[in-house]
Amino acid sequence: MTPFWRGVSLRPIGASCRDDSECITRLCRKRRCSLSVAQE
């Protein structure tokens, strides 16, 4: 049986994404997981 964490592992920087929640950085920009951006 696949461990639970494997099913919900977050995507690395540079991976394709559709939503912020998919990314380890919690930012999906231009369909890529990106560094979170500081609010100046």
């Epitope: 494997r6 592992s9 995507r11 690395p12 920087i13 540079g14 991976a15 380890i24 950085t25 890529r32 997981c33 990106s34 560094l35 951006v37 500081a38 100046e40």
Partner: antibody
Framework: EVQLQQSGTVLARPGASVKMSCKAS????????MHWVKQRPGQGLEWIGA????????SYKQKFKGKAKLTAVTSASTVYMELSSLTDEDSAVYYC?????????????WGQGTSVTVSS | DIVMSQSPSSLAVSVGEKVTMSCKSS????????????LAWYQQKPGQSPKLLIY???TRESGVPDRFTGSGSGTDFTLTISSVKAEDLAVYYC????????FGGGTKLKIK
């Protein structure tokens, strides 16, 4: 040939601010995140943050928010890092570096480092 | 943050010996969709900037001698130098780039 040329050694007083530069050449400056890494004397490497010169987006490690400020001047292909409210803990060598690809942060180009000494 | 731990912190070997050093991450660096490990190794010689040796855990950077080999997957990684040369005197760091970059504490290689 890619080059990252950093500004020279800095001696500063506690409480002061310093601004150092990293001038890039030999690649498309606006297409890569430029990262800054701190190395205290005899210690390891610590990521401070990064700037994307194409749109000036910045990202910081939590502990450096309010301490470091990154800016970029695309016309000069130069990134700057300003450190404020200096303490002895800020005495270190600071490197600018960038990755193999836009979102591949294995850093294959490094500046020579800027040494900052904070002393009264 | 993903925490990177390296061991040993230092080791002394004779020229020609094989050396291995370890790097462990607090969470898996393997991305299942591309089967790549987001891990790099650097060499920093005294007074110099770090130099990239290995990325994707096992891909040697252009120009790096083939005596340097990276291996491992998930959370456990190893850098091996098959036959140490005097010029390999340096500190070796691992770094993950799965998330915000973090580095291990380094392994200092001394030559006997």
């Amino acid at each position: 040939e890619v080059q990252l040329q950093q500004s020279g050694t800095v001696l500063a007083r506690p409480g002061a601010s310093v601004k150092m530069s990293c001038k890039a050449s030999g690649y498309t400056f606006t297409s890569y995140w430029m990262h800054w890494v701190k190395q205290r004397p005899g210690q390891g490497l610590e990521w401070i943050g990064a700037i994307y010169p194409g749109n000036s987006d910045t990202s910081y490690k939590q502990k450096f928010k309010g301490k470091a400020k990154l800016t970029a001047v695309t016309s000069a292909s130069t990134v700057y890092m300003e450190l404020s409210s200096l303490t002895d803990e800020d005495s270190a060598v600071y490197y600018c570096t960038y990755g193999k690809e836009e979102y591949l942060f294995a850093m294959d180009y490094w500046g020579q480092g800027t040494s900052v000494t904070v002393s009264s | 943050d993903i925490v990177m731990s390296q061991s040993p912190s230092s080791l002394a070997v004779s020229v020609g010996e094989k050396v291995t050093m370890s790097c462990k991450s607090s969470q898996s660096l393997l991305y299942s969709s591309n089967q790549k490990n987001y891990l790099a190794w650097y060499q920093q010689k005294p007074g110099q900037s770090p130099k990239l040796l290995i990325y994707w855990a096992s891909t040697r950077e252009s120009g790096v001698p083939d005596r340097f080999t990276g291996s491992g997957s998930g959370t456990d990684f190893t850098l091996t130098i098959s036959s140490v040369k005097a010029e390999d005197l340096a500190v070796y760091y691992c770094q993950q780039y799965y998330s915000y970059p973090t580095f291990g504490g380094g392994t200092k290689l001394k030559i006997k």
